[in-house]
Amino acid sequence: ARNGDDCPLGPGRCCRLHTVRASLEDLGWADWVLSPREVQVTMCIGACPSQFRAANMHAQIKTSLHRLKPDTVPAPCCVPASYNPMVLIQKTDTGVSLQTYDDLLAKDCHCI
Amino acid sequence: ARNGDDCPLGPGRCCRLHTVRASLEDLGWADWVLSPREVQVTMCIGACPSQFRAANMHAQIKTSLHRLKPDTVPAPCCVPASYNPMVLIQKTDTGVSLQTYDDLLAKDCHCI
């Protein structure tokens, strides 16, 4: 498998972590989240060429079959391999609470 | 979130489990796998419209940001939520061995 940064399509074009700034309004959270007002959303974006950051055997199979049957089998997709937690201050029936979300921000990425 | 089978794009067009028949040659395994000669590969294929089989909060965020910035943020992607193990009979330096692979066949799918 190629090194995670050795993108055959050119620097930065393959599956990697990107940060997208989003407001509560952008996320549709304005009615239930108080803080933060803006989130630096880390997400996985980019192409998954052959064996690039292949998550597992399934990703390798997908690559092989996509090469054979590109109209039937999609190429592997760039998705989070793990997440960073994030604490939101949210509105509740009784007032306000602190809540940790485990699956909100991507921590690192792979192809699957 | 919509029910897993309630695809707004039409029956069977959204993220779900598909079976693709593949030979060892198709998979590039002919030189190291003896059996099975053919694999019924289960994989996740299909579109991920808004909130369809959203895996977690991250998938929901991705949907919202894709709607706002379709050229920057891709839509969620249909990937395995879990796997079924599979036993391969493989060639080794000393002969033949049985090996279980845990991450080869998709068991069910979600959008992320």
Epitope: S35, S97, T100 | -
Partner: antibody, heavy 118, light 107 residues
Framework: DVKLVESGEGLVKPGGSLKLSCAAS????????MSWVRQTPEKRLEWVAY????????FYADTVKGRFTISRDNARNTLYLQMSSLKSEDTAMYYC???????????WGQGTLVTVSA | SIVMTQTPKFLPVSAGDRVTMTCKAS??????VAWYQQKPGQSPKLLIY???NRYTGVPDRFTGSGSGTDFTFTISSVQVEDLAVYFC?????????FGAGTKLELK
């Protein structure tokens, strides 16, 4: 090095008031949420109050709500806990803690003892 | 609020022993559990956060595991300096709550 130093300990009568302070150094105080955590004589740990980095959101344990007030002065790098209508069950060692953004307590002061007794 | 039930209350040990203590949350808290060590006369010290992540400088004999409602804290080979009280804490939602503690004492 992160340093948190509590002060204000004392013996107070039930119904009385006391103000605790926590002087912070070794980090950018205004960037971190802070909490007060107390430890009872039976050695039970109880979270008391939490304040966000800018002081815009505040949370209290139900046992102290309406009686205790957490505040901060970012210019002075100091965290406060104003305690009033004190009860004997408020007797505890009070610790100032720094939150690293995930609601666990990464740094603790040495503690300051509050005794509520007639 | 979420109740953290810690067992056992006391754990008699000898140097070199492998010891395990558990913490059970009254509702699902994901991986949001921390473990602290408190030695006599000292303030608590963070050892493990997010169920299994060792905090900076914490020796690898200390490990945490679990998710959902059941969590475990293990010391693979107890050293004399590990004699202390260990507390679990849920950092999932407010009010933040602690277990009652497990005291490690010499047999």
């Amino acid at each position: 090095d992160v340093k948190l130093v509590e002060s204000g300990e004392g013996l107070v009568k039930p119904g009385g008031s006391l103000k605790l302070s926590c002087a912070a150094s070794g980090f950018t105080f205004s960037s971190f949420a802070m909490s007060w955590v107390r430890q009872t004589p039976e050695k039970r740990l109880e979270w008391v109050a939490y304040i966000t980095s800018g002081g815009d959101y505040i949370f209290y344990a139900d046992t102290v709500k309406g009686r205790f007030t957490i505040s901060r002065d970012n210019a002075r790098n100091t965290l406060y806990l104003q305690m009033s209508s004190l009860k004997s069950e408020d007797t505890a060692m009070y610790y100032c803690t720094r939150d690293d953004g995930y609601l666990w307590f990464a740094y603790w002061g040495q503690g300051t003892l509050v005794t509520v007794s007639a | 609020s979420i109740v953290m039930t810690q067992t056992p209350k006391f754990l008699p040990v000898s140097a070199g022993d492998r010891v395990t203590m558990t913490c059970k949350a009254s509702q699902n808290v994901g991986n949001n559990v921390a473990w602290y060590q408190q030695k006599p006369g000292q303030s608590p010290k963070l050892l493990i956060y997010y169920a299994s992540n060792r905090y900076t400088g914490v020796p690898d004999r200390f490990t945490g595991s679990g998710s959902g409602t059941d969590f475990t804290f293990t010391i693979s080979s107890v050293q004399v300096e590990d004699l202390a009280v260990y507390f679990c804490q849920q950092h999932y939602s407010s009010p933040l709550t602690f277990g009652a503690g497990t005291k490690l004492e010499l047999k």
